[in-house]
Amino acid sequence: LRPSRVYKPEGNTKRALTLKDILNGTFSYKTYFPNWISEQEYLHQSEDDNIVFYNIETRESYIILSNSTMKSVNATDYGLSPDRQFVYLESDYSKLWRYSYTATYYIYDLQNGEFVRGYELPRPIQYLCWSPVGSKLAYVYQNNIYLKQRPGDPPFQITYTGRENRIFNGIPDWVYEEEMLATKYALWWSPDGKFLAYVEFNDSDIPIIAYSYYGDGQYPRTINIPYPKAGAKNPVVRVFIVDTTYPHHVGPMEVPVPEMIASSDYYFSWLTWVSSERVCLQWLKRVQNVSVLSICDFREDWHAWECPKNQEHVEESRTGWAGGFFVSTPAFSQDATSYYKIFSDKDGYKHIHYIKDTVENAIQITSGKWEAIYIFRVTQDSLFYSSNEFEGYPGRRNIYRISIGNSPPSKKCVTCHLRKERCQYYTASFSYKAKYYALVCYGPGLPISTLHDGRTDQEIQVLEENKELENSLRNIQLPKVEIKKLKDGGLTFWYKMILPPQFDRSKKYPLLIQVYGGPCSQSVKSVFAVNWITYLASKEGIVIALVDGRGTAFQGDKFLHAVYRKLGVYEVEDQLTAVRKFIEMGFIDEERIAIWGWSYGGYVSSLALASGTGLFKCGIAVAPVSSWEYYASIYSERFMGLPTKDDNLEHYKNSTVMARAEYFRNVDYLLIHGTADDNVHFQNSAQIAKALVNAQVDFQAMWYSDQNHGISSGRSQNHLYTHMTHFLKQCFSLSD
């Protein structure tokens, strides 16, 4: 027997993190995002649940809605109408999928100081929102869209086709919510509140995934979800626009699909209102390398939306799929014709382009061996965007301003030198025309949120600096975090290493690789985190490494598209390469290397364990994909094509975890899955387990009854991390 190794952090003034700290969320941080209601005013929910109004210029602040009013209906969220006469209060939050939930809504009249009675909203509502002007309400109930001109008015029913699990109006079905829109809604008001655009998803022909939900009853109930797996029939999608000025005079008008898209299976990808009578729709072929942006105009004389061919802009990828994870959306300029958009340049780096007439004539606005990530706001004279340009670190995010009023446009980094050590990863929240903005820094130091003047970029005030967290971390021994790159052949891999306190290069440490590795993801980010792996380094003396291999984002298409049509190859290979490099560094105990991952990371960790290299002693896969045929069509096919003989069936079959069952014989494998996983179905782990049993390979497994892909219920999460900790400590011969 190998003697047990106990890691003792030296110096007893500070204590190590405990697993309890992590499970209790003791060291969680706060961010501050203003809820902008004008150019210089915003709302924010205080610690004690009052809704507070702030005016930056007059420095006035007051409670617009008291916590007692919130409490009276157990409200957890709110929304102010643009005319500031009403507030909706949201309660009875009931989660559905990743973004979707249902809730009960109450309308509070701020003028009268009472709840609106008469024509109360039905319950539960699937989505509700105010119009951008006034106080019209659109909401979705039982898959149909309703409209109220004022909160106390009777509703107009806009759609009648809605049917549970069959037809969805104004809300996405499962696959569109998760893999295309990343929202709980599929309706959009025009800027003046005249029109309401919405999508109808017809899932009538989609196969159903069914799984048991055990609950407390004598019999489990069955959850049925129309869920198109790779190659299956997809939702049929139509976009309509209704004139909310005449809901009973004019029916919803369908927006035509571009011919080149409609000729075969296609997706709707996003809708952007350009002006009160101009809308921009984005469509995508089922083979997701061709995207079409279509600009449509309202023809009042026809009561129709016209999308001329000369207002169709095609984006095509010849090396992979269109866009990053999603196809980028346009940021229109004031002329309501030209727009800015991020797409790959000739060198394969994603950059901002200015499109005035055709994509072919696009003017490249940013360039370099880095990527523009998001366009926040385009104003009359400025364009604000984020990128990872600064100092060449792909895992950083800084905010830049391009003065588009100048010729040539001048570029300024707004955040690069603000708090250089503390803050290297920013996002921002802008008032309507960017007169003011908030910067939210996520790290690598303690997160901090600040308010800035949109013209001078001057900091006006600190909104949240996490002082309490700073104080509570004073007596904690935190690990040291390094972000570096390693080279192998012609490839460069960025990695993050979390080193135990008092790390000594002359000693040997166990190594845990945490992997995600999915296409267009990024794990090596300059952000603050105190989580399970922080604890493992702090208390258990484990070195943690995260590596961004091929297929990960923001380092150019050559690196990103390397995995196209062959998932499960290079992602794994690059983790193995990194491990070998880490061993060469001299402080890793080769006998004690483990890998773990969740979801796509569970897939990669499983394949890495089954690589036959002998590098890993043990590993954990939580909710892993085991075959791309089992996963959602939109995702699987984006990166793998179709599972058909004349397309890519062969690699679909070759890239399964089950095909490598024999190779698990010499590793300790812990397989974990929630039985109510709507996303990566339990089927994936069931098939891995079956293959391992058939191969007579021993392994460990844990299921979490009625838990979804996040295994996030308090008790389950505690059990999960405790269980994984025991498994790892046993694997690394660390005593309890």
Epitope: D153, P155, F156, Q157, I158, Y160, Y246, G251
Partner: antibody, heavy 125, light 107 residues
Framework: QVQLQQSGVEVKKPGASVTVSCRAS????????IHWVRQAPGQGFQWMGW????????HHAQDFQGRVAMTRDMSTDTVYMELTSLRSDDTAVYYC??????????????????WGQGTLVTVSS | EIVLTQSPSSVSASVGDRVTITCRAS??????LAWYQQKPGKAPKLLIY???SLQSGVPSRFSGSGSGTDFTLTISSLQPEDFATYYC?????????FGGGTKVEIK
């Protein structure tokens, strides 16, 4: 007082066209939609469409697509409804009716509060 | 389109009687319903709008109720001038549609 005065009886052959006029008086012509509704002998009502006199915008029911045209003359406060390619089943009394809601706030429906006296159109060979 | 079904199609009643006419919508229409009265050879006359609001100048013996799919027109005490045909009309969604009518006749 507020009223809508329609043109007189029409007899037409199949394939022909008919134009019915409706003159408004007693209120601001531009402020209210005018709808057209027909009633076949011994039958119920069929809504045909509307015109917004303020802007001349029209919209009609699918059943009449391509066959009906609604226009207005602001100088005489008159709206016109032309129905083409007449068939025998177009025989009906045609009514113009004022929408009680204002064109400025058309989303509240208060019913058709003023009707014309009706125009009988007979289509027969 | 939304179909409105009126019942009964005809009713015989005497002066002073309470008469109730129902209108059922094939789908929910909230309160967007109007009632009209039509006498032979005449244009219809608006009685009730928004399901229950009495049009000005209409006697208070007429009342409307209901929301969603089921609506009622009630004449509390029938008068000689009330013998006519009554129609409901929905305005929740395009196209606007009318019920088939209910004829109120003298018993």
């Amino acid at each position: 007082q507020v009223q809508l005065q329609q043109s007189g009886v029409e007899v037409k052959k199949p394939g022909a066209s008919v134009t019915v006029s409706c003159r408004a008086s007693g209120y601001s012509f531009a402020d209210h939609f005018i709808h057209w509704v027909r009633q076949a002998p011994g039958q119920g009502f069929q809504w045909m469409g509307w015109i917004n006199p303020n802007r001349g915008v029209t919209h009609h029911a699918q059943d009449f697509q391509g066959r009906v045209a609604m226009t207005r003359d602001m100088s005489t406060d008159t709206v016109y409804m032309e129905l083409t390619s007449l068939r025998s089943d177009d025989t009906a009394v045609y009514y113009c009716a004022r929408d009680a809601s204002l064109t400025a706030r058309p989303y509240y429906f208060y019913g058709f509060d003023v009707w014309g006296q009706g125009t009988l159109v007979t289509v027969s060979s | 389109e939304i179909v409105l079904t009126q019942s009964p199609s005809s009713v015989s009643a005497s002066v002073g009687d309470r008469v109730t006419i129902t209108c059922r919508a094939s789908q929910g229409i909230s309160s967007w319903l109007a009632w009209y009265q039509q006498k032979p050879g005449k244009a219809p006359k608006l009685l009730i709008y928004a399901a229950s609001s009495l049009q000005s100048g209409v006697p208070s013996r007429f009342s409307g109720s209901g929301s969603g799919t089921d609506f009622t027109l009630t004449i509390s005490s029938l008068q000689p001038e009330d013998f006519a045909t009554y129609y409901c009309q929905q305005a929740n969604s395009f196209p606007l549609t009318f019920g088939g009518g209910t004829k109120v006749e003298i018993k």
